[in-house]
């Protein structure tokens, strides 16, 4: 139809940058990260939301690949597993150079667009991946991390997660501890996007009050449309507007309709609501493909983005608003974060207090001096 044709026309010029895709987790889960396993061929990969033909059909021009290690690795092998997941993203990009271009900057994304490749960036999903260490944080930056989700679905010693708001976790940091504040400041200094998906409302607010640059929600939807605590409430959306930040809508059925079933139109309802409260410049896409068990009817995999864009056009979104949601908003935020970075400024050095450091299998070098 007309709107589908228009969507494709727009996306040829302005492909989608998606904020969160868990294909790297699937590569671990299905193949233990053995990309040369013949079943792991990304051109023919079956049983996932994501493969190369689907990315092409969906006009995906940029992807933050999720580097995720589960919460039960906290205080155990979280850092090792984080490094292994970063490695699998790097290897994936090298193995399919005609499809993926590994990039670490907004300029790199634009370069990938020019080359017709999928700009491939690393987002680290969960603050437990840094093991409460600013040194680990800086090392992950050197290895390509360009966003850090402050928590996954567990508290860290320095930030609270969304389950605090459901009553399933106890608040520990009242948003951000003093060390958590240092993490936020260091992310600003490095030029790493701060991701507030999965965090508690108190952590959202504390971070939006502290960060000097815009932040993102890499895969979260609108609480007023579906009252899941993984979604963003309106008072926070107003702070998103003030700070030129970005909410990249998650497609998981239970965060879209608050039931096991959802459809594309209901996803558009979330996009409409965020646009209404925070403005069109605050809207993006973070489908969470390959990270969720149920996706909406009409958004079965990454090939379906043009159908969602067609629905927005049908709802009288302007071409500029659609292009914003596809790519321009994320590029604007990323550029602001890059401009706010200051690698000549002294790095944060004060470590987390020993009594706040979780886990029993630790040495205490440095703390006694």
């Amino acid at each position: 139809d007309f709107f589908r044709d228009e969507a494709e026309r727009i996306m040829r010029d302005s492909p989608v940058i998606d904020g969160h895709n868990d294909l790297p987790w699937q590569l671990l889960d299905m193949f233990n990260n053995r990309l040369q396993d013949e079943r792991a061929n990304l051109t023919t990969l079956a049983g996932t939301h994501t493969n190369i033909p689907k990315l092409r059909a969906g006009f995906v021009g940029g992807q933050f690949w999720s580097v995720y290690t589960p919460c039960d690795t906290q205080n155990k092998d979280a850092v090792r597993r984080t490094l292994e997941q970063m490695d699998v993203v790097h290897r994936m990009c090298r193995m399919y150079p005609e499809t993926f271009l590994y990039v670490t900057s907004s300029a790199g994304i634009r370069q990938a667009f020019r080359e017709g490749k999928v700009a491939s960036l690393i987002g680290v999903e969960g603050g437990h991946s840094i093991d409460s260490s600013l040194g680990v944080l800086r090392a992950l930056y050197q290895l390509g991390m360009r966003y850090l989700t402050l928590t996954h679905s567990c508290n860290t010693p320095w930030a609270d997660n969304w389950l605090v708001d459901t009553g399933d976790s106890e608040p520990q940091s009242q948003g951000l501890s003093p060390f958590g504040q240092r993490v936020v400041k260091e992310l600003n200094r490095l030029g790493v996007l701060i991701d507030l998906a999965h965090v508690s409302v108190a952590t959202m607010k504390a971070t939006l009050q502290l960060s000097r640059a815009p932040v993102i929600f890499s895969h979260s939807s609108a609480y007023s449309v579906c009252a899941s605590r993984r979604n963003v409430p309106d008072d926070v959306l107003r702070l998103v507007k003030q700070t030129d930040s970005l909410v990249m809508v998650n497609f998981y059925n239970n965060y879209i309709s608050c039931t096991n079933k959802a459809n594309l139109s209901q996803v558009a309802d979330h996009l409409d609501h965020i646009k209404e409260v925070a403005g069109a410049r605050a809207v993006g896409f973070g489908g969470d493909f390959d990270g969720v068990p149920r996706v909406p009817e009409g958004l079965e995999d990454v090939s379906k983005y043009p159908d969602l864009i067609a629905e927005l056009l049908r709802r009288n979104w302007t071409e500029a608003e659609v292009k914003g949601a596809l790519a321009d908003n994320l590029l604007r935020v990323f550029e602001a974060v890059e401009q706010a970075s200051n690698l000549t400024q002294a790095p944060e050095e004060e470590p987390i207090p020993l009594d706040q450091l979780g886990g029993s299998c630790r040495t205490h070098y440095g703390y006694s001096s």
């Epitope: 939006l208 000097r212 700070t243 030129d244």
Partner: nanobody, 128 residues
Framework: EVQLVESGGGLVEYGGSLRLSCAAS????????IAWFRQAPGKEREVVSC????????DYADSVKGRFTISRDNAKNTVYLQMNSLKPEDTAVYSC?????????????????????WGQGTQVTVSS
């Protein structure tokens, strides 16, 4: 180094108006969100209002909403606080503060320690 100078304070009757100014001498405020704070005798300093870099986005504490208006003139490097319907409880020393940010709005809840530059303050007294 940004130097902020407040002016416009004074003694005013209940229900009256004042317009405070916060001027930056020899430096630009273009890249700074600006907030007005106040401290009444024996009380902690509290935020009153803030305005983003371009002036298009602002916010207000509940206690002054509908009575106070913040604005800025970047060409003059000055931020204004128009205070109407003043009450005795508005009596305080009013100070402006500047915070370097890379977004266009402002966040009222940002802690005082996150502001980079402060003025000396101007006294506002509202008589009953």
């Amino acid at each position: 180094e940004v130097q902020l100078v407040e002016s416009g304070g004074g003694l005013v009757e209940y229900g009256g108006s004042l317009r405070l100014s916060c001027a930056a001498s020899e430096s630009t405020l273009d890249n700074y969100a600006i907030a007005w704070f106040r401290q009444a005798p024996g009380k902690e300093r509290e935020v009153v209002s803030c305005v983003g870099k371009s002036g298009g986005r602002s916010d207000y504490a509940d206690s002054v909403k509908g009575r106070f208006t913040i604005s800025r003139d970047n060409a003059k490097n000055t931020v204004y606080l128009q205070m109407n319907s003043l009450k005795p409880e508005d009596t305080a020393v009013y100070s402006c503060a500047a915070r370097r940010v890379w977004f266009g709005g402002c966040v009222l809840g940002t802690s005082q320690g996150q502001y980079d530059y402060w003025g000396q303050g101007t006294q506002v007294t509202v008589s009953s």
